[in-house]
Interface confidence: low
């Protein structure tokens, strides 16, 4: 999927744009807002009725190299008594992010943008029940 | 930077870390995933901590459209379909990387930007504080 070039309806291309070879783009990987931190409620992964665990995946040829994935602990949801209620479902909530992938072909190195689907956490849903004749 | 194993047969001039600026292919690898969460699943309506999705659009960013979740209630929906305020709906937030046009308006020059998005909501038992 190509990154859409922005049409002239939005803006004209400034003269100051750096020259870029055809079929590629220049990417500065010094991250804007690098030190921003998530300020989620404390321990929501344990306090949720659809609790989850975290796993860290590590890939030295990916930037960022560390990606954290969540996995729902149960098929059902935890009820007020702390028991699993299988009439409800714990389901993963996912979000896309971008990473930069480094590829080695012989001694040459190329870089590729990649979409990665991250499981962020879980939520408890009422199941869809189909009545079949 | 990130250290990587290097092919021992390659010249030593190769940098072990990611350089600050790279040229990348315009094609983004990995499935044409459906970026509209309203179409990809109806969890936002079926959840006990339902949420609404708000479209955030910025032509200077890729992807230009990001969907932000806002929990509909303070409490969670119980078995009777009513809001139970003994439980809390809370947003699940995630840092994601996007591309920011830099310099602004340039078609093929970007910088990575970290942004915080609320992806959905989950129902949690509240932390109760007893105030004297």
């Amino acid at each position: 999927r190509k990154i859409p070039k922005v049409g002239h309806t939005f803006f004209q291309k400034p003269e100051s744009c750096p020259p870029v070879p055809g079929g590629s783009m220049k990417l500065d990987i010094g991250i804007i807002n690098e030190n921003q931190r998530v300020s989620m409620s404390r321990n929501i992964e344990s306090r949720s009725t659809s609790p989850w665990n975290y796993t860290v995946t590590w890939d030295p040829n990916r930037y960022p190299s560390e990606v954290v994935q969540a996995q729902c602990r149960n098929l059902g949801c935890i009820n007020a008594q702390g028991k699993e209620d299988i009439s409800m479902n714990s389901v993963p909530i996912q979000q896309e992010t971008l990473v930069v992938r480094r590829k080695h072909q012989g001694c040459s190195v190329s870089f590729q943008l990649e979409k990665v689907l991250v499981t962020v956490g879980c939520t408890c849903v009422t199941p869809v029940i189909h009545h079949v004749q | 930077g990130i250290t990587i194993p290097r092919n021992p047969g390659c010249p030593n001039s190769e940098d072990k870390n990611f350089p600050r600026t790279v040229m990348v292919n315009l094609n983004i690898h990995n499935r044409n995933t459906n970026t509209n969460p309203k179409r990809s699943s109806d969890y936002y309506n079926r959840s006990t901590s339902p949420w609404n999705l708000h479209r955030n659009e910025d032509p200077e960013r890729y992807p230009s459209v990001i969907w932000e979740a806002k929990c509909r209630h303070l409490g969670c929906i119980n078995a009777d379909g009513n809001v139970d305020y003994h439980m809390n709906s809370v947003p699940i937030q995630q840092e994601i990387l996007v591309l920011r046009r830099e310099p602004p308006h340039c078609p093929n020059s970007f910088r990575l930007e970290k942004i915080l998005v609320s992806v959905g909501c989950t129902c949690v038992t509240p932390i109760v504080h007893h105030v004297a």
Partner: nanobody, 123 residues
């Protein structure tokens, strides 16, 4: 985009009643949770109450639930606050506010706010 304009404020004697109105512009009024906040002189803005888009869920601050009544008329794009048994401590600027989620409105983080109308309770 929603514009909110409050009216109905004024001077009232202790024990008296007053009805505030909030007229909203925009065709999507019924999709918003709307409510009232108030700010007394020298104090922080506080939540009074709110009502869901359809009007079937109404939320009151515990201290006001017996004296104040919130209602809405979606055909007129209007929110109301009926106040009775007014006391001197009810003197404040009353603000109308709207958001698509009650959770945001409840904690004063609404998307839309009116300019406010002053209610003075004094003999």
């Amino acid at each position: 985009e929603v514009q909110l304009v409050e009216s109905g404020g004024g001077l009232v004697q202790p024990g008296g009643s007053l009805r505030l109105s909030c007229a909203a512009s925009g065709r999507t009024f019924s999709s918003y949770v709307v409510g009232w906040f108030r700010q007394a002189p020298g104090k922080e803005r506080e939540f009074v109450g709110a009502i869901s888009g359809s009007g079937d869920s109404i939320y009151y601050a515990v201290s006001e639930k017996d004296r104040f009544t919130i209602s809405r008329d979606n055909s007129k794009n209007t929110l109301y606050l009926q106040m009775s048994s007014l006391r001197a401590e009810d003197t404040a600027v009353y603000y109308c506010t709207a958001d698509q989620e009650f959770g945001y409105l409840r904690f004063g983080r609404s998307e839309y706010w009116g300019q406010g109308t002053l209610v003075t309770v004094s003999s």
